[in-house]
Interface confidence: low
């Protein structure tokens, strides 16, 4: 019968002919009376056989990622009679893996949006690298993920590529972060290959800033002839948040005379001081009122950022008009 062991050839071997193993008949007594032949795809071009001994060699560099096994046929003939000594037999040559492929991130570019001030542990995005090497061959395709850029704000789970928040971030300080993730095969051991990807993480706004008046004192004037409903000036607060988180409402906090009102222009986010009652220079020629400003929408969990509304003082001078 036929005698052989399992045949393996490492991929990417640079030797001009790499000995793989030996095929022989147990009837072969070593006196060179038998002839061995190799048939099938790759016979003669990729693999050759020593016709006298049955030793098989690879004569080309092989790439396991291109082709991982070859199915060949063997024959053995008695040279004297030309007859087959053994029935033709099929055998397999497996191409064994070496770590010659770096991990690749196939779904680039990565981009994620996460609310600012999200707590530690919040999931941001999962990145996944692929390694063309053999997952069943040692650690050649076993990947570990690590963070090259993004500390101390982000962390990556080493085995899953899940990116999480590791420290609170404030959009008003920085609204986007570039995180660089490395995937390393061989579970980080010597000889490991690596690939990197960039993840753009954008912070969405939460209402963690209250509006604050630009000035602590505004000076306005009103003519005593002004009718009620007259706009006598504007006041303005600023809010570091954006969008609806920066929408604000102005109101009167203190006006003993109940002469003025403030309405909010929701397009410009200005407060418009309105005359509610007519004024009389001869009766009172100046007024002092206090205004406050608050955000329009404040979720309950963000109320701690909105204690004590910002206030401002408005001094209003009444202008005299000649009366008949």
């Amino acid at each position: 019968g036929w005698v052989w062991n399992q045949f393996f050839v490492p991929e990417e071997m640079n030797t001009t002919s790499h000995h793989i193993g030996q095929l022989r008949s147990d009837l072969d007594n070593g006196n060179n009376s038998f002839q061995y032949k190799l048939l099938g795809a790759g016979a003669g071009s990729t693999f050759i056989i020593d016709e006298r001994t049955g030793d098989i060699y690879a004569i080309q560099k092989l790439d396991r990622e291109e082709r991982s096994l070859y199915i060949l046929r063997a024959q053995v003939i008695d040279i004297a009679t030309g007859r087959a000594v053994e029935p033709e037999s099929e055998f397999v040559i497996k191409v064994s893996d070496i770590n010659d492929n770096e991990p690749k991130f196939l779904d680039e570019p990565y981009e994620a949006i996460v609310p600012e001030m999200s707590p530690e542990g919040t999931l941001v995005i999962q990145v996944t690298a692929s390694d063309a090497d053999d997952p069943s061959s040692g650690n050649n395709a076993r990947l570990l993920y690590s963070l090259l850029q993004g500390q101390p704000y982000f962390s990556v789970e080493p085995t899953t590529g899940v990116i999480r928040i590791s420290s609170k971030m404030d959009r008003e300080l920085q609204d986007e972060y570039w995180v660089i993730i490395q995937a390393k095969d061989m579970i980080g051991q010597p000889g490991a290959l690596s690939g990197t990807t960039s993840v753009l993480i954008k912070l969405s706004d939460v209402n963690d800033n209250k509006p604050i008046f630009k000035e602590s004192l505004y000076r306005l004037t009103v003519s005593e002839s002004a009718p009620t409903g007259t706009s006598i000036g504007t006041i303005m607060a600023y809010d570091n948040d954006i969008g609806e988180n920066a929408e604000m409402d102005y109101s009167i906090e203190e006006d003993d005379s109940q002469t003025f009102d403030i309405i909010t222009n929701h397009e410009t986010q200005e407060g418009i001081v309105i005359l509610k009652k007519k004024v009389d220079f001869e009766h009172q020629n100046h007024y002092g009122i206090r205004a406050k400003v608050k955000n329009h929408h404040v979720p309950e969990q963000l109320m701690k950022y909105h204690t004590e509304a910002s206030t401002t003082f408005i001094k209003i001078q009444v202008e005299d008009v000649d009366e008949p």
Epitope: P119, Q151, S167, K168, D170
Partner: antibody, heavy 120, light 111 residues
């Protein structure tokens, strides 16, 4: 280089109040929180409270609620810490420390400290 | 009793590596930056490590910080006599809505 210069040492009787000042320079005063931290003789650091000079927002440690008042004067870039109903255990060095632009960011610069002695 | 727990003392000889731990909870170390301060005798505290592991300019790279879960640690390698000081960890606490300090660790450099 940021500078925080505190007022001089004080000796007070039990029951009195003390007001310590901290003058800031070489940075935008209204952008950063300011904390007050005290250290009793031979003891560790104890956070008292924090103020944002721009809006006057304050947060006080539970222990000092009702006894401490922190204020800021933007015209002179100075913050003040007033502690009332003093008792002997309030004898300590009081430090002002500049925080970040958020409540939860580190204190990067400290004043030289003001020794307050409470003794009858 | 401090919210953050530090060993009261630590020691080492010149050239040695010393580690100081700081243990807290989810509401402080678990969800905020850890900072370390060095206080030399008779002086104001000085920021040594901020945002868990960053060093301000002028702080030697012998000092390093790390954080894992609800604990943090300060490591000092190549210990020098001038490192003899008190070391405090500090962190913002979300539950208390305020800052908390560790009780402090007195580091002695043995000659």
């Amino acid at each position: 280089q940021v500078q925080l210069v505190q007022s001089g040492a004080e000796v007070k009787k039990p029951g009195a109040s003390v007001k310590v000042s901290c003058k800031a320079s070489r940075y935008t005063f209204t952008s950063y929180y300011m904390s007050w931290v005290r250290q009793a003789p031979g003891q560790g650091l104890e956070w008292m409270g924090i103020i944002h000079p721009s809006g006057g927002d304050t947060t006080y440690a539970q222990k000092f609620q009702g006894r401490v008042t922190m204020t800021g004067d933007t015209s002179t870039s100075t913050v003040y810490m007033e502690l009332s109903s003093l008792r002997s255990e309030d004898t300590a060095v009081y430090y002002c420390a500049r925080g970040g632009i958020k409540l939860w960011l580190h204190f990067d610069y400290w004043g030289q400290g003001t020794l307050v002695t409470v003794s009858s | 009793q401090s919210v953050l727990t530090q060993p009261p003392s630590a020691s080492g000889t010149p050239g040695q590596r010393v580690t100081i731990s700081c243990s807290g909870s989810r509401s402080n170390i678990g969800s905020n930056f850890v900072n370390w301060y060095q206080q030399l005798p008779g002086t104001a505290p000085k920021l040594l490590i901020y945002t868990n592991n960053q060093r301000p300019s002028g702080v030697p790279d012998r000092f390093s910080g790390s954080k894992s879960g609800t604990s943090a640690s300060l490591a000092i390698s190549g210990l020098q006599s001038e490192d003899e000081a008190d070391y405090y960890c500090a962190v913002y606490d979300d539950s208390l809505n305020g800052w908390v300090f560790g009780g402090g660790t007195k580091l002695t450099v043995l000659s």
